[in-house]
Interface confidence: low
């Protein structure tokens, strides 16, 4: 049997060395001369030569101080042998435990902690958590840590608390105001021995940044503004308004959104934000007319891009201001309004016939006196214009059916000028009233009838005059020869068309058929139709094949 039990020694022992630990004893020493020896870590393994045993006495010694944080314990093996090498005893495992001394300071995991929270947050809001480690023996007072805040900059009032065992920092006030202070610096402490005054302690820094919330409304620096703009100007900036907002610059909590609340029913204005300066830029986007309104009063409002954060705020969530816009008169010269004016004249009116013309006026006086007129364009030179009155006179016969006339209206362009030389232009539309000066006629003079698949063709007449001087038309075969009457029949099918059909089986060939068309007032014209009777299925097949009964392709009667 071995005598020793596990022994211990204090780390960092001051000695004196060699330091006696205990005596190893074997019962076999009563019967034998016993030599004691040891092996293992701290003896013949690293850290070498830390322990030794006296061969004869079994006294166990330590030669130098030990750091528990490096070696918690040593398991060495003790041997009992006789001088001749006989081992009457089994080797003894011997544990030497190194007892902890509070020789390590707790250390924060970070030199500086940085946390961010929003201003105005509720009491008890978690800011963040700090943590420290201690190399001394776990689950002992040497590693039982307590956290605390020992300083705050700016110092007053105390706004944060720290949980002593978890290191969690929370707010103790809801009065965090970024606009007043946007950063706090805490000095924090951790102490072992459960925070008792003799425990080892370390400090660190914790920076708490206060983030902005939109708790300030943008407010106009003035409640009323006066500006002016010349009438008829457009796309111009007429005013810049400024706002104050204590929230964080260049964020959605600070950026302003302007709006026109009242007075812009006609859409003359718009207000936009200058992204660089945050000013409201009031612009005219539709021209103003001094003669209509000399002053306009706008109400403008401003909010932030971000919604306002204060619930149940007693204040309205929008600052407003009034803008008085004085419209300045511009000496505009004559106004051609409406730009298109019309008069009525009979076509074929006699040369020298006069009519009212284009009228321009001075917008300041609403009067036309003193305005001079001149033709700018007159496509066919049919009229002249009176310089003083603007009235027109027929210079050449007016023809409603001329090619230059569209929809019976003849347009001339007029330049009006005042005594100061300012001008405007307008269009005078002369509505030409129709007279029955055109006969109806048949525009399609060539007709192909495929025989025998077709027995007739439709003949359509037109009259350039107004409908009142046009259809219904009267169609008739115009011929003194009985041959035409024998070969052809003509029958009206509506007001503007008739059906021409052949009879008595005429031969293939070309025929001239004269047709008279009369309008409702009896004005008439004769159109000679070229009618081809062809051996074909469709008109496109016709290659003018002549009837073999009449020999060579001569022109038939009436041509």
């Amino acid at each position: 049997r071995w005598a020793p039990i596990p022994c211990s020694m204090l780390e960092n022992s001051l000695g004196p060395f060699p330091l006696f630990l205990q005596q190893v004893q074997s019962d076999t020493a009563q019967n034998y001369t016993i030599y004691y020896s040891i092996r293992g870590p701290g003896v013949d393994q690293e850290p070498r030569n830390l322990f030794y045993v006296e061969r004869d006495t079994g006294n166990l010694y330590c030669t130098r101080p030990v750091d528990r944080e490096q070696y918690e314990s040593f398991e060495i093996i003790a041997f009992a042998t006789t001088p001749d090498g006989y081992t009457p005893e089994l080797p003894l495992p011997l544990i030497i435990k190194i007892e902890d001394e509070n020789d390590n300071y707790p250390i924060f995991t970070e030199e500086t902690y940085t946390f961010t929270i929003f201003e105005n947050c509720r009491v008890g809001t978690t800011v963040g958590q700090v943590c420290a480690t201690d190399k001394d023996e776990p689950d002992t007072m040497h590693t039982r840590l307590k956290y605390s805040i020992i300083g705050q900059v700016p110092p007053s009032p105390t706004l944060f608390s720290m949980h002593p065992t978890t290191g969690v920092i929370t707010t103790t006030s809801s009065q965090l105001d970024r606009e007043l202070i946007d950063k706090y610096q805490l000095k924090i402490k951790v102490q072992d021995m459960d925070g008792q005054y003799f425990g080892l302690q370390t400090t660190s820094t914790c920076i708490i940044n206060i983030d902005d919330v939109n708790d300030h409304l943008p407010t106009f620096t003035r409640t009323s503004y006066v500006t002016s703009v010349e009438e008829n100007t457009v796309d111009v900036e007429i005013l810049r308004v400024t706002v104050e907002d204590k929230d964080l610059v260049n964020t959605a909590n600070w950026r302003a959104n302007y709006t026109i609340l009242k007075g812009n029913e006609n859409g003359n204005f718009k207000i936009v934000t200058d992204a660089k300066t945050n000013e409201g830029v009031l612009c005219v986007v539709k021209p103003l007319n001094y003669e209509e309104k000399q002053q306009m009063i706008l109400q403008i409002g401003v909010v932030n891009e971000a919604p306002f954060s204060r619930e149940a705020s007693p204040r309205s969530a929008m600052s407003t201001a009034t803008v008085t816009v004085n419209v300045e008169d511009q000496d505009e010269g004559p106004e051609c309004n409406p730009p298109i004016q019309t008069v009525r004249m009979k076509e074929n009116a006699e040369v020298g016939t006069t009519s009212n013309g284009y009228k321009a006026y001075d917008p300041e006086t609403r009067s036309s006196s003193g305005i001079r007129y001149k033709k700018l364009t007159d496509p066919t030179g049919w009229v002249t214009i009176d310089e003083n009155t603007g009235s027109i006179k027929v210079f050449r016969s007016l023809d409603r059916e001329a090619e230059t006339i569209k929809n019976g209206i003849y347009n001339i362009t007029v330049l009006a000028s005042d005594q100061g030389g300012r001008t405007c232009t307008g269009t005078l539309g002369i509505i030409l009233q129709d007279v029955n000066d055109n006969s109806p006629f048949i525009p399609k003079k060539t007709v192909i009838i495929c025989k025998p698949t077709m027995s007739s063709a439709e003949i359509v007449a037109v009259d350039p005059d107004e409908p009142i001087h046009g259809p219904p038309f009267d169609f008739s075969l115009e011929s003194s020869t009985s041959e035409v009457q024998r070969m052809w029949r003509l029958k009206a099918i509506n007001d503007t068309a008739a059906r021409l059909s052949y009879q008595n089986d005429p031969p293939f060939g070309s025929y001239v058929v004269p047709i008279t068309v009369r309008d409702r007032l009896g004005m008439s014209s004769v159109t000679s139709l070229d009618v081809t009777l062809c051996d074909c299925i469709t008109e496109n097949d016709c290659t003018h094949r002549v009837d073999p009964r009449i020999g060579g392709g001569g022109v038939q009667l009436g041509k």
């Epitope: 007043l180 202070i181 946007d182 950063k183 610059v249 660089k276 300066t277």
Partner: antibody, heavy 117, light 103 residues
Framework: DVQLVESGGGLVQPGGSRKLSCAAS????????MHWVRQAPEKGLEWVAY????????YYADTVKGRFTISRDNPKNTLFLQMTSLRSEDTAMYYC??????????WGQGTTLTVSS | DIQMTQSPSSLSASLGGKVTITCKAS??????IAWYQHKPGKGPRLLIH???TLQPGIPSRFSGSGSGRDYSFSISNLEPEDIATYYC????????FGGGTKL
């Protein structure tokens, strides 16, 4: 009424240091960015440094970068300019100015710094 | 960096007359220019910002215009208290003053 009062100027030897202060009143100091601007004798105005309302943004002119430090204490309504490694060409009247959006709308009367041996 | 070239560097004029000062930027500054009046022993005084917007309390004798790189500043009906040095300031990208014009 907005008021800015600079102090801390005086005679400094080349290589020396000096800290200028600017006391602000009459407005919410913590809502406005601030500048330092200087004017050397017989020369024009030269922008030196800028600090935003919450100190989150700072800019320096190339001529002072690495030698000057701008800072502010919002609760005390005070702006600072810490100047080190001073040179004779830093001799000037130093003004602090308030930023209204991006331009300077109010200026102090200035404090004179002379760098000479 | 943006450079501001201000001219002339000095000028004389008669009371009641008109003067014009110009500033040319080394690049487009998007109308972000301000004009200051500086008298000895005082801090500069803001007259105009954003090219042509007059500060409250500044008489309408002072005016500004321009766009792109070219800007001008005028004083009409000159009065004795207008004797000063005038500076332009660009604030489109950081801040640069013109060299000044002594009136």
């Amino acid at each position: 009424d907005v008021q800015l009062v600079e102090s801390g100027g005086g005679l400094v030897q080349p290589g020396g240091s000096r800290k200028l202060s600017c006391a602000a009143s009459g407005f919410t100091f913590s809502s406005f960015g601030m500048h330092w601007v200087r004017q050397a004798p017989e020369k024009g105005l030269e922008w030196v440094a800028y600090i935003s309302s919450g100190s989150s943004t700072i800019y320096y002119a190339d001529t002072v970068k690495g030698r000057f430090t701008i800072s502010r204490d919002n609760p005390k309504n005070t702006l600072f300019l810490q100047m080190t490694s001073l040179r004779s060409e830093d001799t000037a009247m130093y003004y602090c100015a308030r930023v209204h959006y991006y331009y300077f709308d109010y200026w102090g009367q200035g404090t004179t710094l002379t760098v000479s041996s | 960096d943006i450079q501001m070239t201000q001219s002339p560097s000095s000028l004389s004029a008669s009371l009641g007359g008109k003067v014009t000062i110009t500033c040319k930027a080394s690049q487009d500054i998007n109308k972000y220019i301000a004009w200051y009046q500086h008298k000895p022993g005082k801090g500069p005084r803001l007259l105009i910002h954003y090219t042509s917007t007059l500060q409250p309390g500044i008489p309408s004798r002072f005016s500004g215009s321009g766009s792109g790189r070219d800007y001008s500043f005028s004083i009409s009906n000159l009065e004795p208290e207008d004797i000063a040095t005038y500076y332009c300031l660009q604030y489109d990208n950081l801040w640069t003053f013109g060299g000044g014009t002594k009136l």
